[in-house]
């Protein structure tokens, strides 16, 4: 994909209850299986139909999972991350990073791409400042009439 793609990054705590067939999703990533360049984090690659994650509705394909039951997922081998989920118990708390594309343009496969995004405040602060300056200038102009 050409050009820079910017992302709106948000974090969320998702509590899942393990269903009859488990948690119901697949992951990619790890120190031995980087999915995003320069990032060995763990990403959701698939949400299985009618699984616990799908029925809950909050976890999305492409989300980065930061921790499981408070345990950080940094610098883990892929299989070690898988085992962590499998041994996480009945009630599983996930700290998740959602990334939404905010720039217009073609949406491509996010894997192996540039993980850098811009937080929302970096977008909103300049917009807000410009709005305030414009409003102030308009009021000054009206007073001079």
């Amino acid at each position: 994909m050409n050009g820079r793609v910017d992302y709106l990054v948000t974090e969320e705590e998702i509590n899942l209850t393990r269903g009859p067939s488990g948690l119901g999703f697949n992951i990619v990533g790890g120190t031995d299986q980087q999915y995003v360049s320069n990032d060995s984090g763990i990403y959701v690659s698939r949400i299985k139909e009618n699984g616990a994650a799908a029925l809950d509705g909050r976890l999305q394909e492409g989300d980065k999972i930061l921790s499981v039951n408070g345990q950080d997922l940094k610098n883990l081998l892929h299989q070690d991350a898988v085992d962590l989920f499998r041994n996480a118990g009945y009630a599983v708390s996930l700290r998740v990073q959602h990334r939404l594309q905010v720039q217009n343009g073609p949406i491509g496969h996010r894997g192996e791409g540039d993980p850098s995004g811009i937080p929302i405040f970096m977008v909103l602060v300049p917009v807000f400042a410009l709005t305030m300056v414009a409003a102030w200038a308009f009021m000054r102009y009206r007073q001079q009439l």
Epitope: S21, G22, L23, G24, F25, N26, I27, V28, D32, Q33, Y35, V44, S45, R46, K48, H78, Q79, V82, F85, R86, H109, G111, E112
Partner: nanobody
Framework: DVQLVESGGGLVQAGGSLRLSCAAS????????MGWFRQAPGKEREFVSA????????YYGDSVKGRFTISRDNAKNTVYLQMDSLKPEDTAVYYC?????????????????????WGQGTQVTVS
Amino acid sequence: DVQLVESGGGLVQAGGSLRLSCAASGRTFRYYSMGWFRQAPGKEREFVSAISWSGDSTYYGDSVKGRFTISRDNAKNTVYLQMDSLKPEDTAVYYCAGAFGSTVDNYDPSDPREYDTWGQGTQVTVS
């Protein structure tokens, strides 16, 4: 997502060998666990073999153990099924399947629901 295309099927005599290939498009192939299934006319789909994303783990159905060998070449985006000592009961359409990523649940490579991408199949006939 990747697309899967099988090749290498054909007609072979009992005791002979065939090598099936499953070529995947797309650069994400190395994240996929891959499997082979088969379906004979009037029968249910049957698990043949599977291989992990890294190639470190392989799995086989009881009916093919010791005769079939699965392998993969991530540089060529291809998974192979070497079939030796073929029997007439191996006659079927052979399907390649892929699962994007590793399930965080108990893994059953013989469960078709584990796989999210399927090829169109290649016919193998053993006379």
